[in-house]
Interface confidence: low
């Protein structure tokens, strides 16, 4: 668990691939929009420290969130990063340490009671890698019981599939996560070659529906196995 507050550049000096692109020269505008970066967090420099790869926040510890370690996201790998303390910049709730949430791009205390006027019932919600996203930055949702008890419809922001209505799953869309339809027979699916690789997808697909599995399309012939199309097929 990343729980020490130390050198902010430590993560940038990791060996490739995790830190490979951290210091690359480049334009301030990256081709891939706004992947999250560690921001104000400081990282522990321990010889045997191994960054934990992840695809979503739930795979990390309670004091961590899942993001690309580089500002531009060029390294293409997400790891668990230390949560951000109060008053630090954030783009979604999960970035803030326990007891805090993301409001207007800043981690504020959950019991902070200075909301006024029209902002009183709004919160900045987590978008994958935003203010809420990679596109990820701030999503505000009216704070009401509906937010917690109504299952998300297609396109609704979500944190996990249980937030979504039946027939939908929670999948990344840019760097936010929204409810998308579970795949049906014949629909193109993504076969992950290694654990965690789904963290690299900007447009993440849902899994195949019940009784279906993601397999190479039998009549799809390509020179390379890696480029063959996968579809949801009956077991």
């Amino acid at each position: 668990t990343l729980n020490s507050v130390l050198n902010s550049n430590a993560i940038k000096n990791l060996p490739p691939p995790l830190g490979g692109a951290a210091g690359h020269p480049g334009s301030a505008v990256s081709a891939a929009p706004g992947i999250l970066y560690p921001g104000g967090n400081k990282y522990q420099t321990i010889d045997n420290y191994q960054p934990y790869p992840c695809a979503e926040d739930e795979e990390c510890g309670t004091d961590e969130y899942c993001a690309s370690p580089t500002r531009g996201g060029d390294a293409g790998v997400q790891i668990c990063l230390a949560c951000r303390k109060r008053r630090k910049r954030c783009m979604r709730h999960a970035m803030c340490c326990p007891g805090n949430y993301c409001k207007n791009g800043i981690c504020v205390s959950s019991d902070q009671n200075h909301f006024r006027g029209e902002i009183e019932e709004t919160i900045t919600e987590s978008f994958g890698n935003d203010h809420s996203t990679l596109d990820g930055y701030s999503r505000r949702t009216t704070l009401s019981s509906k937010m917690y008890h109504t299952k998300g419809q297609e396109g609704s922001v979500c944190l996990r599939s249980s937030d979504c209505a039946s027939g939908l799953c929670c999948a990344r869309h840019f760097w936010s996560k929204i409810c998308k339809p579970v795949l049906k027979e014949g629909q193109v699916c993504t076969k992950h070659r290694r654990k965690g690789s789904h963290g690299l997808e900007i447009f993440q697909r849902c899994y195949c529906g019940e009784g279906l599995s993601c397999r190479i399309q039998k009549d799809h012939h390509q020179a390379s196995n890696s480029s063959r199309l996968h579809t949801c097929q009956r077991h």
């Epitope: 929009p33 706004g34 029209e118 902002i119 709004t122 978008f127 930055y137 505000r140």
Partner: antibody, heavy 116, light 108 residues
Framework: QVQLVESGGGVVQPGRSLRLSCAAS????????MHWVRKAPGKGLEWVAI????????YYADPVKGRFTISRDNSKNTLYLQMNSLRAEDTAVYYC?????????WGQGTLVTVSS | SYVLTQPPSVSVAPGQTARITCGGN??????VHWYQEKPGQAPVLVVY???DRPSEIPERFSGSNSGNTATLTISRVEAGDEADYYC???????????FGGGTRLTVL
Amino acid sequence: QVQLVESGGGVVQPGRSLRLSCAASGFTFSRYDMHWVRKAPGKGLEWVAIIFYDGSNKYYADPVKGRFTISRDNSKNTLYLQMNSLRAEDTAVYYCATLAAAFDYWGQGTLVTVSS
Amino acid sequence: SYVLTQPPSVSVAPGQTARITCGGNNIGSKSVHWYQEKPGQAPVLVVYDDSDRPSEIPERFSGSNSGNTATLTISRVEAGDEADYYCQVWDSSSDHVVFGGGTRLTVL
């Protein structure tokens, strides 16, 4: 490629109105709070206004409150600044920007000159 | 409303270290971001969250923030660093973005 392109600037007389536009591309505009920031000749950067990602909340700097209105059309990926009752001191280059740290991008600006 | 105070100008010889300060009431409790602005160009973020740096910004740029003062430090200053520098915070009590008045860095 993320792009913010401002337009609508020009020369206008005091007391008149002008509407600036900012066309966004290369990112999902509807998910970001957006800002207008201005730079008057020989002066520093001055924040003008913010609009939340969905248009639900808007906040303005004191010098423009009641005269300027920030708005957005997420279906057109466009941010607007309606400027009424313009004054000489509103003369500046106006930038639209995300100001979101990890996603800190600015347009190149559009010049507004208020002069009789 | 929250006010950020910067010195109007700082001069430094090439190869030396420039320090630009940004004063504000208990600014150490806020996240401070620094922008570099060159004539005719849009501002560029050089330091965010007090002391972190976008990957495309040279390591010569660093920041610190505590008490009532935030500082942008530019080591081994080059001619190309000549520009206006602004500190910026989000004032959550007013929901306003606040910029400092700016500091002109002159490389002698």
